[in-house]
Amino acid sequence: VPRWRQQWSGPGTTKRFPETVLARCVKYTEIHPEMRHVDCQSVWDAFKGAFISKHPCNITEEDYQPLMKLGTQTVPCNKILLWSRIKDLAHQFTQVQRDMFTLEDTLLGYLADDLTWCGEFNTSKINYQSCPDWRKDCSNNPVSVFWKTVSRRFAEAACDVVHVMLNGSRSKIFDKNSTFGSVEVHNLQPEKVQTLEAWVIHGGREDSRDLCQDPTIKELESIISKRNIQFSCKNIYRPDKFLQCVKNPEDSSCTSEI
């Protein structure tokens, strides 16, 4: 008799998930020699242990603690770049500005970036058919809990001036329901963080509006100010030119507004 399997609303585990996580771990240690002490097999075992044989709607931050411990990493706390709904540009930026870090530039973020995973209660199988959707099924699923856990820790580690890249093309430039709005903003430590500086990235070539005056940015400013952290905001009118100027700051065209 075929065993009944829960059908979730979200896509199933990414194909080659175990191989991808293990390969990414080894690649990460290859390109970050300071992380060569990490035992990638143990990392995979801890990752697997967080969700295998567990109900995929009943995952807790506690389940990920062994993985968090193995992936402990020190990044310069004053060089943190958060982002919301504009991941690609944030990553292009840290590729050029090598001393700044997004969450995906850390081992744990790099391991899980763009992947989906879940298991099934009481079986050691990985579910490649479907996984819970955050909205339609449950919020305490393996992927959501993972990102909530690592995002919280990343924000808690930040100090001095923290930067956040926001997508000015979206109807909600700051979205309280995003990981940035629901987790990271509330876990910045006022005793360590002096300022949150938002970079609002414009989408349209001819868009010269001051998006720092957007109501959702004002809402972000209010939340941050209430937490005794200063807030500042900059418009990035030309993201392509912005990246080019990060690469070549001495370029004569880089003195004007970008």
Epitope: R16, A23, K27, P33, H91, Q95
Partner: antibody, heavy 120, light 107 residues
Framework: QMQLVQSGAEVKKTGSSVKVSCKAS????????MHWVRQAPGQALEWMGW????????DYAQKFQDRVTITRDRSMSTAYMELSSLRSEDTAMYYC?????????????WGQGTLVTVSS | DIQMTQSPSSVSASVGDRVTITCRAS??????LAWYQQKPGKAPKLLIY???SLADGVPSRFSGSGSGTDFTLTISSLQPEDFATYYC?????????FGQGTKLEIK
């Protein structure tokens, strides 16, 4: 079986650019960092840089920073190394190489090499 | 950058001889060292990784030792196919660097 096959020999003029390709087969291209190493005639090996084929992230030796660009085409499982503003000292054999994950970070697999000759 | 210094730069030996090549790093590289063999017109071949581990398919007459800054490649009994150039390489830190090579010639 695992193979790295490079493009053919090139003869280039001083000041021009060269783009060497390295086609990977027999393994998942995105699972391994790809490195580029060169060797001038009668000289030692010299590491130039790496690319993470999954994301396209790169890092270069300071010496080549301003002149080298390493890229990849995931759909073709191919890495590329482009060197610009060529000078006679760039005449060398250029290799792509990768580790085996089981052999520390030594380069267990190498392409056959591409000879680039720069003439004035 | 970490400097890798090999000695000797060339050595003449006969089949059956025991040969030792040394490699010194300008700073501590722990055991993050590889040895390669290269024959004319060919790509290098990995012999030893992590200073003392033998790569797959490499004959057991090759061995590596050392850690920190001083390393040795030993060929216990030279075979005709061993006449080649040998390079050490550190992968402790970027940029990865190679020694200048040791040419092993027939006496």
């Amino acid at each position: 079986q695992m193979q790295l096959v490079q493009s053919g020999a090139e003869v280039k003029k001083t000041g021009s650019s060269v783009k060497v390709s390295c086609k990977a087969s027999g393994y998942t291209f995105t699972d391994y960092i790809m490195h580029w190493v060169r060797q001038a005639p009668g000289q030692a090996l010299e590491w130039m840089g790496w690319i993470d084929p999954e994301y396209g992230r790169t890092d270069y030796a300071q010496k080549f920073q301003d002149r080298v660009t390493i890229t990849r085409d995931r759909s073709m499982s191919t890495a590329y190394m482009e060197l610009s503003s060529l000078r006679s000292e760039d005449t060398a054999m250029y290799y792509c190489a990768r580790s085996a994950h089981t052999t520390g970070f030594g380069f267990a697999y190498w392409g056959q090499g591409t000879l680039v000759t720069v003439s004035s | 950058d970490i400097q890798m210094t090999q000695s000797p730069s060339s050595v003449s030996a006969s089949v059956g001889d025991r040969v030792t090549i040394t490699c010194r790093a300008s700073e501590d590289i722990y055991s993050n060292l590889a040895w390669y063999q290269q024959k004319p017109g060919k790509a290098p071949k990995l012999l030893i990784y992590d200073a003392n581990s033998l790569a797959d398919g490499v004959p057991s007459r090759f061995s590596g030792s050392g850690s920190g800054t001083d390393f040795t490649l030993t060929i216990s009994s030279l075979q005709p196919e061993d006449f080649a150039t040998y390079y050490c390489q550190q992968y402790n830190n970027y940029p990865y660097t190679f020694g200048q090579g040791t040419k092993l010639e027939i006496k």
